[in-house]
């Protein structure tokens, strides 16, 4: 019986340029974890095995590190990276449990108050 | 440039364990991890694990469990693959291969190690 | 295990003939796959990695695409170095898995 839980950072928002990290922690289950996919709607961002360690798929190598620990730290971020993330957890002998975490990217205020205040 | 090289072929009997080696160079261990993939004659390739010298974790393919055991010297940059008990089914070509830097697929590869398992 | 289904097994072609080799997965694997080529007596090599990236000083006439389960590997216009058998692999979870491969003949 699947008795573990993910507990995710849930809703998070960030400002456009920045970076974000994306965490999620398996508890309430003594299954072994031996794999955690970041995946964000049909594309898959980076695999964390844990004897293996990182893949990250090429078409974020760019803007994706590695860590903390199982998670993923998204960089340089855009307005289109808002949406939904989502963690895999495959774990032995329990299974797969899935984590959700909705990104919001937000325009900087920084930039908008830096481009109406120019230096001539 | 990047190199694989893996020991010579070898004849056992069944129940023994054979031991293939397979020496690296040409690049760090840095964000790859080292495979070992086995093709029986005239058949398709079987993963059979890999192992990451950074961490020094290990993963196998539950067929194998038990009886495959990957190690790596990183000191002379040589990684192992011990099979025991083998079978006659065994027999087969053994490859090492490297993963790409930070990716799970195999861009390098050892030139193969045959094992013939016969009583 | 994941399976990884590869069709057709074996194909006859002529040199500068398109052709495409089909992998299906037994279940999603989004794009974590790769192609690879393999000569009689030699190790594979390898041709796509994450579906759709061409491996560095691999030919432009391999392309590889596909995400989910739906994976093709094309070769547009057949050369002779080209006859060979190639595999798809998934590395979404362990066990890495492969094809049980596709071996291109000369028509």
């Known amino acids: 019986m699947m008795t573990g839980t993910i507990e995710t950072t849930g809703n998070i928002s960030a400002e456009k340029g920045g970076s974000i990290i994306l965490q999620c922690h398996l508890s309430s289950t003594t299954a072994q974890v031996t794999q955690v996919n970041w995946e964000q709607q049909d594309q898959l961002l980076a695999i964390c095995n844990a004897d293996l360690g990182w893949h990250i798929s090429p078409s974020f190598k760019d803007r994706v590190a590695p860590g903390p620990g199982l998670g993923l730290t998204l960089q340089s971020l855009t307005v289109n990276d808002t949406g939904e993330y989502f963690c895999i957890y495959h774990t032995y002998p329990d299974g797969t449990y899935t984590g959700r975490i909705f990104l919001e990217v937000l325009e900087s205020s920084v930039a908008e108050h830096g481009a109406r205040f120019q230096i001539p | 440039q990047v190199q694989l090289v893996q020991s010579g072929a070898e004849v056992k009997k069944p129940g023994a364990s054979v031991k293939v080696s397979c020496k690296a160079s040409?690049?760090?261990?840095?964000?790859?991890?080292i495979h070992w993939v086995r093709q029986a004659p005239g058949q398709g390739l079987e993963w059979i694990g890999g192992?990451?010298?950074?961490?020094?974790?290990?993963s196998y393919n539950q067929k194998f469990k038990g009886r495959a055991t990957l190690t790596v010297d990183k000191s002379i940059s040589t990684a192992y693959m011990e099979l025991s008990r083998l079978r006659s089914d065994d027999t087969a070509v053994y490859y090492c291969?490297?993963?790409?830097?930070?990716?799970?697929?195999?861009?390098?590869w050892g030139q193969g190690t045959t094992v013939t398992v016969s009583s | 295990d994941i399976q990884m289904t590869q069709s057709p097994s074996s194909l006859s072609a002529s040199v500068g003939d398109r052709v495409t080799i089909t992998c299906k997965a037994s279940q999603d694997v989004k794009t974590a796959v790769a192609w690879y080529q393999q000569k009689p007596g030699k190790a594979p090599k390898l041709l796509i990695y994450?579906?759709?990236f061409r491996y560095t000083g691999v030919p432009s006439r391999f392309s590889g695409s596909g995400s989910g389960a739906d994976f093709t590997l094309t070769i547009s216009s057949l050369q002779p170095e080209d006859f060979a058998t190639y595999y798809c692999?998934?590395?979404?979870?362990?066990?890495?898995?492969f094809g049980q491969g596709t071996k291109v003949e000369i028509k």
């Open positions: 692999q998934q590395h979404y979870t362990t066990p890495w898995t």
């Open positions: 994450s579906a759709s």
């Open positions: 192992f990451n010298p950074n961490s020094g974790g290990s």
């Open positions: 040409g690049f760090t261990f840095t964000g790859r991890s």
């Open positions: 291969a490297r993963s790409s830097y930070y990716r799970f697929d195999l861009d390098y």
